[in-house]
């Protein structure tokens, strides 16, 4: 009932933008984006009792005031401001577990170890996780057509911008031990050019945070190799010692037996190197 | 200089009305928070509003000012309102205004304050 | 509801004492550290001492210093001025960016 009276109330028409309007070369934002975020937003606010006073309306307000009426590339942190102060959230800092390139275990790995938080496990991830937005310079409507992309078109776009911001903002309040959580399947395991290595590295403060544990998750059954002493692995580790912060590494040779590990950790099995 | 300013203050009855006034200036007003904050008499301090309107008015309560007051904004008078409605002897206080530090790094903390307008609500 | 509970409530002191006020919060700060603590005359506003827990607010004197984290605040006054006696509030920011203050604690003269 709460969904139905947000738009009783407003009766918003999101128009799409007409085809002949300009054409980016991303997909256009998500399919009832607006409905998506609102109900994303009460189920949240209503399963977390901290966020229990989080009006949606408010949070939706902030969130289209970012992006509508304004240039798709030409978005900024200071765009965002009032969605971020709207979601403020407080976790336990030292709880936190970043990721990149490997989103959907380290979410397994939070739905099982349910007093880990991943970006997405709070309120403002948990809105945007998978969907797309944007709108266009002087006009109120919501482009379902196409966005930019980041590669081809712009990187200051409404989605680039949410997600680097939030995710500062996310590395900022971590403390003691953090966890991040990368995918040893890839070429560069650890990418300086993923929002990890980009933004959440650079923005743990090392008057909090301790330590920084890596999790280099392999993906062959046979692969035995020590990951931890990949090239980009300690690159990672440079980044890191030099901002004062420790750091530690950890091969997760098998993830499916990681994941059930966690589950039951009493498993005489999981006494092993997984 | 910044500077908030409070008005609309004074005697009220019991389930009566008043809108109170912020009127700031030495700043550009549409880049911050303003919050309204009330003070009991010989009692501590609490939060009761706010809003920021960089194009639209994005605004929250504390809980127990959800339905009875309202807070909104005249950016052409770089005046911040609060109408309180139903009001209670328990809403006696006097009502400050104050800007939130600009910056992630900053918010939630009130650099600025006006000099408050006292609130007295007795039949 | 986020309870913000300062101690003590009243401290007496001389000028050139070393002063402690205690904030605990009922619920983490957001940030672990998003703190800050105002002092406040009478018939006056408050002014803003300290933020983010340990940070001077500009034109602050260095007098004034802040730690803690998480639940529990301390402000301390490492020698009282003639100037310094007021009542001293802390407060929290939290999740849904709400905000919360203590019930403050008046530092008088002995």
């Known amino acids: 009932s709460g969904l139905n009276d947000i738009f009783e109330a407003q009766k918003i028409e999101w128009h799409e933008v007409p085809r002949w309007r300009q054409q980016w070369s991303g997909p256009g934002t998500t399919k009832r984006f607006p409905e998506t975020v609102l109900a994303r937003c009460v189920k949240y606010t209503e399963i977390h009792p901290e966020m229990r006073h989080v009006d949606c309306q408010s949070v939706w307000d902030a969130f289209k005031g970012a992006f509508i009426s304004k240039h798709p590339c030409n978005i900024t942190e200071e765009d965002y401001q009032p969605l971020m102060k709207l979601g403020t959230q407080t976790v336990p800092c030292n709880k936190i577990l970043l990721w990149s390139r490997i989103k959907d275990l380290a979410h397994q790995f939070t739905q099982v170890q349910r007093d880990m938080f991943t970006l997405e496990d709070t309120l403002l991830g948990y809105l945007a996780d998978d969907l797309t937005w944007c709108g266009e310079f002087n006009t109120s409507k919501i482009n379902y057509q196409s966005c930019p992309d980041w590669r081809k078109d712009c990187s200051n776009n409404p989605v680039s911008v949410f997600w680097k911001t939030v995710s500062r903002r996310f590395a900022e309040a971590a403390c003691d031990v953090v966890h991040v959580m990368l995918n040893g399947s890839r070429s560069k395991i650890f990418d300086k050019n993923s929002t990890f290595g980009s933004v959440e590295v650079h923005n743990l403060q090392p008057e909090k945070v301790q330590t920084l544990e890596a999790w280099v998750i392999h993906g062959g059954r046979e692969d035995s190799r020590d990951l931890c002493q990949d090239p980009t692995i300690k690159e990672l580790e440079s980044i890191i010692s030099k901002r004062n912060i420790q750091f530690s590494c950890k091969n997760i040779y098998r993830p499916d037996k990681f994941l059930q590990c966690v589950k039951n950790p009493e498993d005489s099995s999981c006494t092993s190197e997984i | 200089e910044v500077q908030l300013l409070e008005s609309g203050g004074g005697l009220v009855q019991p389930g009566g009305s008043l809108r109170l006034s912020c009127a700031a200036s030495g700043f550009s007003f549409n880049n911050y928070w303003i919050i309204w904050i009330r003070q009991a008499p010989g009692k501590g301090l609490e939060w009761v509003a706010a809003?920021?309107?960089?194009?639209?008015?994005?605004?929250y309560y504390a809980d127990w000012a959800k339905g009875r007051f309202t807070v909104s904004k005249d950016n052409s008078k770089n005046t911040v309102y609060l109408q309180m409605n139903s009001l209670r002897a328990e809403d006696t206080a006097v009502y400050y205004c104050?800007?939130?530090?600009?910056?992630?790094?900053?918010?939630?903390?009130?650099?600025?304050w006006g000099q408050g307008t006292l609130v007295t609500v007795s039949s | 509801d986020i309870q913000l509970t300062q101690s003590p409530s009243t401290l007496s002191a001389s000028v050139g004492d070393r002063v402690t006020i205690t904030c605990r919060s009922s619920q983490s700060v957001y940030g672990h550290n998003w703190l800050a603590w105002y002092q406040q005359k009478p018939g006056k506003a408050p002014k803003l001492l300290m933020y983010r827990a340990s940070n001077l607010a500009s034109g602050v004197p260095s007098r004034f210093s802040g730690s803690g984290s998480g639940t529990e605040f301390t402000l301390t006054i490492s020698s009282v001025q003639p100037d310094d006696f007021a009542t001293y509030y802390c407060?929290?920011?939290?999740?849904?960016?709400?905000?919360?203050f203590g019930g403050g604690t008046k530092v008088e003269i002995k």
């Open positions: 104050a800007r939130e530090l600009s910056g992630s790094s900053y918010e939630g903390y009130f650099e600025s």
């Open positions: 407060q929290g920011y939290y999740s849904g960016a709400s905000y919360a």
């Open positions: 809003i920021y309107s960089p194009s639209g008015d994005i605004k």
